[in-house]
């Protein structure tokens, strides 16, 4: 009886794993083995595919074959018993185009209100992604184990920290990789769960802001308690993209080591041009806080995106705010030749309830105010360019009293 050649051959490539699956053509014939040959583009001869010779099952692995993943190859299969079937040729394919990104490795660290996620490619030193290692981005889905309500976080790199979590709570997450340059989306990792710790005695510093004064950077933050010492560290932002390397060499800012105030001043020449991450930690001598949220600090933007200067004209039920160019030292206005959007925050002096207005115009009306009431206003500028999504620090607050009633005309 003539052997039929196998059919429906599927090539599955995940990272550097090359798997072939096929269907037997004739289930009734026992003790059949299968063998594959392969042919590279521009070659006439067929070569035996190592790892896929005389296979008794309907699956084989040819990962050991050192292929050029960007070069098209063709496969053929036949069944063998006493005699052999005719060859069945599989459509030619390019491994890189066919490859899927496998599940990444995930490593979690817990704090009281944060989780640090370290992500590595699933295959270390992968041949398939050798030219794309730095192009991987990741996305994750995270949920509280108790609720199951999912939150998605897109476009993260090999180190990501999620803040504002609840203490003593189990969070679960899964991560997948993407190579946007090749339109490839990977397979999710297994689910990883971790419980945040009991609440720390000392909270981390908050609201870190960098501003420029003369030739110095001024770093300010808020802290709950007095009589603390603080230290500030920096890291090159691009290091968060480094795949597989999870040793982050945070550096101390010398003028910001063991400072006793909630600000520190250091010369601009501490940093060369670039994008950095900054973080602050508090200590009372016995206990240490966890690190603050990391803020991104771009020396290029910081140098020119200064807080706006504004004047207020007070009416009985509103303020008219006129925004002008920020001043450099020496009182000369800074020319900012890129479009800005202004965020104006105002509040009643006796209350903490803030209201916000976002405006492109440089003259803004703050409506619905009460007469003879002191309101405070602060403002900051944001760049409108998508790629240059940066913000200035807030200006100092200016407080004014509204006029008596009936002066709104």
């Amino acid at each position: 009886k003539n052997l039929k050649s196998p059919q429906k051959v599927e090539v599955d490539i995940i990272d550097d794993n090359f798997i072939l699956r096929w269907n037997r053509s004739d289930e009734s014939v026992g003790n059949v083995t299968f063998s594959f040959d392969y042919q590279k583009t521009g070659m006439d001869n067929w070569i035996k595919l190592s790892g896929c010779q005389n296979i008794t099952s309907t699956k084989c692995n040819f990962s050991s074959l050192k292929l050029n993943v960007y070069e098209e190859i063709k496969l053929r299969i036949r069944a063998e018993k006493e005699n052999t079937s005719s060859w069945y040729e599989v459509d030619s394919f390019t491994p890189f185009r066919k490859a899927q990104i496998g599940p990444p490795e995930v490593h979690l660290e817990a704090e009281d209100k944060a989780i640090v996620i370290h992500i590595s490619p699933g295959t270390k030193d992968s041949v398939m992604w050798a030219l794309d290692g730095l192009s991987f981005t990741y996305s994750l889905v995270i949920w509280k184990n108790s609720s199951g309500v999912e939150e998605r976080i897109e476009n993260i790199y090999s180190r990501h920290k999620i803040y504002k979590l609840s203490p003593e709570t189990t969070y679960c997450l899964k991560v997948k990789a993407a190579l946007l340059t090749s339109w490839k989306i990977g397979v999710y990792s297994p689910v990883h769960c971790i419980k945040t710790t009991v609440e720390n005695e000392l909270p981390p510093p908050e609201n870190i802001e960098v501003s420029v004064q003369n030739q110095n950077y001024v770093l300010k933050w808020d802290y709950t308690y007095a009589n603390m010492t603080f230290q500030v560290q920096w890291l090159h932002a691009f290091l968060k993209r480094n795949p597989g390397n999870h040793l982050y060499k945070w550096k101390q800012i010398p003028d910001c080591e063991n400072v006793k105030t909630t600000q520190c001043v250091f010369p601009q020449n501490v940093f060369q041009k670039g994008i950095y991450l900054l973080r602050v930690q508090a200590s009372d001598g016995n206990n240490t806080s966890f690190w603050s949220e990391e803020i991104k600090f771009d020396t290029e933007i910081q140098a020119f995106l200064l807080p706006p200067v504004f004047n207020i004209r007070s009416l009985s039920d509103s303020f008219h705010i006129y925004i002008g160019a920020p001043k450099q030292s020496g009182n000369t206005p800074v020319i900012q030749d890129y479009p800005l959007i202004y965020e104006i925050i105002f509040w009643e002096n006796t209350s903490n309830a803030e209201r916000k207005i976002i405006e492109k115009k440089t003259d803004v009306t703050v409506p619905n105010l009460k007469p003879l009431t002191v309101y405070c206003v602060k403002a900051r500028a944001h760049t409108m360019d998508e790629k240059l999504n940066k913000s200035s620090v807030f200006s100092d607050a200016v407080c004014e009293k509204t006029k008596p009633g009936n002066t709104s005309k």
Partner: antibody, heavy 118, light 107 residues
Framework: EVQLQQSGAELVKPGASVKLSCTAS????????IHWVKQRTEQGLEWIGR????????KYAPKFQGKATITADTSSNTAYLHLSSLTSEDTAVYYC???????????WGQGTSLTVSS | DIVMTQSQKFMSTLVGDRVSVTCKAS??????VAWYQQKPGQSPKALIY???YRYSGVPDRFTGSGSGTDFTLTISNVQSEDLAEYFC?????????FGGGTKLEIK
Amino acid sequence: EVQLQQSGAELVKPGASVKLSCTASGFNIKDYYIHWVKQRTEQGLEWIGRIDPEDGETKYAPKFQGKATITADTSSNTAYLHLSSLTSEDTAVYYCSRGGNFYYFDYWGQGTSLTVSS
Amino acid sequence: DIVMTQSQKFMSTLVGDRVSVTCKASQNVGTNVAWYQQKPGQSPKALIYSASYRYSGVPDRFTGSGSGTDFTLTISNVQSEDLAEYFCQQCNSYSYTFGGGTKLEIK
């Protein structure tokens, strides 16, 4: 294969100083931290300090500030621990260790025994 | 400095048994804790990092757990080659302090 090869045992007199070495193979020390740890006989481990060989930045445990100086020579892939004004309290085994991913000490040298005696 | 306390200096166990070595931090260190094994006359060997992750090549009978201030190294199905001293260490902040060690004796 990652290895940290430490210099041989030392016998020195009180008041003298000594320089211990730790030569790495299988990795580039610039990509890691190198730590030094002290262990006295039948006692626990004490962290002395560490160096970032990439830029020479060092950190020391307060107890070893002024006693220990850590340096590195990236051309020979070697880190050094210099101990000064030695006393019998400095008699111990000194280990170098690699600070790897997530800051943990993933590989250790075989240790150098230092004896301070007159 | 953060103090790491291993309250049991010695522990005795039988081959095949399960034993838990504990370690307490003087303040919350998250999950930034490692465990090391030191056999007599040898240098320490890394077993566990980030409280619960096993280094490659470490047998899966070694398990780390805990977070915040309380950490445990569990050895299930103890083998004679596990006779050693076990140290915990915090890597949350400088200095990288170690526990005093727990010596495991095999009966």
